[in-house]
Interface confidence: low
Amino acid sequence: RKNPKAGVPALQKAGNCPPLEDNTVRVDIRIFNQNQGISVPREFQNRSSSPWDYNITRDPHRFPSEIAEAQCRHSGCINAQGQEDSTMNSVAIQQEILVLRREPQGCSNSFRLEKMLLKVGCTCVKPIVHQAA
Amino acid sequence: RKNPKAGVPALQKAGNCPPLEDNTVRVDIRIFNQNQGISVPREFQNRSSSPWDYNITRDPHRFPSEIAEAQCRHSGCINAQGQEDSTMNSVAIQQEILVLRREPQGCSNSFRLEKMLLKVGCTCVKPIVHQAA
């Protein structure tokens, strides 16, 4: 089953809406939900059998300008005894996200959509075993 | 000092950056990076010790209009024998993403940004045990 990505190539037309004239839309600068204190639960990163850390990337010409990227702490997974089990693999779960890029860089009020593949956290998987013929 | 345009306060400009004209920015919706063949690896969802499925949400007034949300398959985690181990918990990793919301709904080329908390995949964690006093 094909899974749609978070960055479909063109803005879907709602019903019989005509196409956009110049590939640009106007976006209100208020951000809906911005004050809801929505935050990504961080406590899982240490309790997981595939723990991870966050690296913060900063880019003032991007919105959001600060993005946290996950990095798996081990190649294997942590077992019930707290030891690394190399028969399993810690892998990063990736999510395609949309960001806005100031264009041209500087104080322009024009942006363009940009796709980013973000490592969000890690999960423990069974490795794919390639059998010898 | 009266400013003729409602909602557009006059500004002393530092540098050469003009103020926003009408509380909106222009966004080019041609997505940079869209042809790089970026795709989210989906095979982890079944091989994980905390497997998950995807539910597709569709909203023609949102961009992207289709978003895949993860749902953990089990409350516990899958052990090496393929059995569910209820001493561990499958939990969803969440990521805050930006989407564009058509406003008002219809054919308008005006949008607003909206934050969404998206379940991206699942990871296996040690439960928090509350000790009896």
């Epitope: 600068i29 208020r30 951000i31 911005q34 004050n35 003032p60 919105f63 959001p64 300008s65 600060e66 806005l100 104080c107 009020n109 942006f111 | 000092r1 009266k2 400013n3 409602a6 909602g7 306060p9 006059a10 500004l11 002393q12 400009k13 530092a14 540098g15 050469n16 950056c17 003009p18 103020p19 926003l20 509380n23 920015v25 940004l113």
Partner: antibody, heavy 123, light 108 residues
């Protein structure tokens, strides 16, 4: 925790200077325009000054223009207000406030406030 | 400069009653009007923006209406924590953020 903490207030003589600071935490500072709003004892609110994400847009109330200077240091998550030639009528509680606009631009509504720092101008 | 006049200056009501606060602008501010709540010793809190949009986390008992020069903040049923001073603010003209003088809602 998302918060703004003001500092630098105090008792100062007329004609002297004072520099207020606002330390932001819990959010990405340069994603927001920032403002100073003041409140004289027992009185209402008065917007003083605002600055957008990259200091490209700056505004002042007529009552402080030419005397006060707003600035920000995004690397330090800090907002400042340099107040020169202070007058008795500048006596107030000074609040640091975050604009509710996105992209670091002005929307001119204030969605997050600090607790304020008191400035008293008296001889 | 646009002047915002709030009335009444003081509103004495009991918990459970409906509160209606008025804000009148000296010239049209279209729908660019916000309402803030301030409790003693605390910073203001945004309640309503652009005349009728509730800020995030604000209870449904608070609602705003109006456009042009006449605006109303309504608290459908007063809770004990709602007794405070309420300010309106316009963002339509220079200076970009002027406030009304405030309405104090006190317990009768």
């Amino acid at each position: 925790e998302v918060q703004l903490v003001e500092s630098g207030g105090g008792l100062v003589q007329p004609g002297r200077s004072l520099r207020l600071s606002c330390a932001a935490s819990g959010f990405t500072f340069d994603d927001y325009a920032m403002h100073w709003v003041r409140q004289a004892p027992g009185k209402g609110l008065e917007w003083v000054s605002g600055i957008n994400w990259n200091s490209g847009g700056i505004g002042y109330a007529d009552s402080v223009k030419g005397r006060f200077t707003i600035s920000r240091d995004n690397a330090k998550n800090s907002l400042y207000l340099q107040m020169n030639s202070l007058r008795a009528e500048d006596t107030a509680l000074y609040y640091c406030a975050r604009d509710m606009g996105g992209f670091g631009e002005f929307y001119w509504n204030f969605g997050l406030w600090g607790r304020g720092t008191l400035v008293t101008v008296s001889s | 400069e646009i002047v915002l006049t709030q009335s009444p200056a003081t509103l004495s009501l009991s918990p459970g009653e409906r509160a209606t606060l008025s804000c009148r602008a000296s010239q049209s501010v279209r729908s660019y009007l916000a309402w803030y709540q301030q409790k003693p010793g605390q910073a203001p809190r945004l309640l309503i923006y652009d005349a009728s949009n509730r800020a995030t986390g604000i209870p449904a008992r608070f609602s705003g209406s109006g456009s042009g020069t006449d605006f109303t903040l309504t608290i459908s049923s007063l809770e004990p924590e709602d007794f405070a001073v309420y300010y309106c603010q316009q963002r339509s003209n220079w200076p970009p953020a002027t406030f009304g003088g405030g309405t104090k809602v006190e317990i009768k």
